[in-house]
């Protein structure tokens, strides 16, 4: 089989400070050296990229400096951090991994993470 | 208006080279991998080469590696075929395409025709 | 190299019928790697399904994908007189990207 499995939990609750982490890992049916990660957000039928990266195996994951994601990777296995998100951000986000190098390439696309994001109810006022 | 437009294309002799471009707007090109495919008159989709965002990673179909060289200028919005030592099966319409997100072409180019004749 | 097999070469049909396109691959395809183009003559290829089963933005609900593995199935629930086209189907999960041989859908 040439397919590459990619596995990402089905459902993750954001913290009450908005960050979401979970983790996305994938059956290499090669042996990649250079790797890139991409977090895309699929909203009825849109799809939009939220991050990447591309890493080199054994090396850290390295998101631009203004993403919303930072990562760390381990084998074939990334987890992957979601900051700043509102309830308005709640979707499904999918890990998409390519293998970039050595040849041949293969791409990844996993299932989707169900993000739930419930934004924090403000403080009452004290009354002192 | 999101699309991608082909250049280049023209008649050229056995073992001679040509440049194909394609210009891309309506979206952030550096977002996306791309592809060339081309189209023997009267024949299939052939897959010719691939481009990585950045450019660092390229792949070719057996029948052109080492003729054909993919290129890209993510600040002019643009992707290249340098097409060298061509034969004549190396006639068809190139065609440009967009990887998706998801992965398939979702936006073609309306493609150049390359005809290799003596 | 993944080969695609796409049956029958020519689907002879009637406007207002259905058509069955088959596509077999050579060795297991993931379903979110399988793709359907329609190409009419002198265009360029539009991408129908992808993901095996999923309609590109703007495509139809008379055009439906299935199947898993190695076998892969276009139907057009009734054929509209645009549809007579030629049909590939193509599998993006791994390089070299390859495409079936085809499928032309005629009028009876």
């Known amino acids: 089989c040439k397919a590459m499995h990619v596995a990402q939990p089905a459902v993750v609750l954001a913290s009450s400070r908005g960050i979401a982490s979970f983790v996305c890992e994938y059956a290499s049916p090669g042996k990649a050296t250079e790797v890139r990660v991409t977090v895309l957000r699929q909203a009825d039928s849109q799809v939009t990229e939220v991050c990447a990266a591309t890493y080199m195996m054994g090396n850290e994951l390295t998101f631009l400096d203004d993403s919303i994601c930072t990562g760390t990777s381990s084998g074939n296995q990334v987890n992957l951090t979601i900051q700043g998100l509102r309830a308005m951000d709640t979707g499904l986000y999918i890990c998409k991994v390519e293998l970039m190098y050595p040849p041949p390439y293969y791409l990844g696309i996993g299932n989707g993470t169900q993000i739930y994001v419930i934004d924090p109810e403000p403080c009452p006022d004290s009354d002192f | 208006e999101v699309q991608l437009v082909e250049s280049g294309g023209g008649l050229v002799k056995p073992g001679g080279s040509l440049r194909l471009s394609c210009a891309a707007s309506?979206?952030?090109?550096?977002?996306?991998?791309m592809h060339w495919v081309r189209q023997a008159p009267g024949k299939g989709l052939e897959w010719v080469s691939f481009i990585s965002y950045d450019g660092n990673y390229k792949y070719y179909a057996d029948s052109v590696k080492g003729r054909f060289t993919i290129s890209r200028d993510n600040a002019k919005n643009s992707l290249y075929l340098q097409m060298n030592s061509l034969r004549a099966e190396d006639t068809a319409v190139y065609y440009c395409?967009?990887?998706?997100?998801?992965?398939?072409?979702?936006?073609w180019g309306q493609g150049t025709m390359v005809t290799v004749s003596s | 190299e993944i080969v695609l097999t796409q049956s029958p070469g020519t689907l002879s049909v009637s406007p207002g019928e259905r058509a069955t396109l088959s596509c077999r691959a050579s060795q297991s395809v993931g379903s979110s790697y399988l793709a359907w183009y329609q190409q009419k003559p002198g265009q360029a290829p539009r991408l129908l399904i992808y993901g095996a089963f999923s309609r590109a933005t703007g495509i139809p609900d008379r055009f439906s994908g299935s199947g898993s593995g190695t076998d892969f199935t276009l139907t057009i629930s009734r054929l509209e007189p645009e549809d007579f086209a030629v049909y590939y189907c193509q599998q993006y999960g791994s390089s070299p990207w390859t495409f079936g041989q085809g499928t032309k859908v005629e009028i009876k």
């Open positions: 309506g979206f952030t090109f550096s977002s996306y991998t």
């Open positions: 395409a967009r990887t998706s997100l998801l992965g398939p072409f979702d936006l």
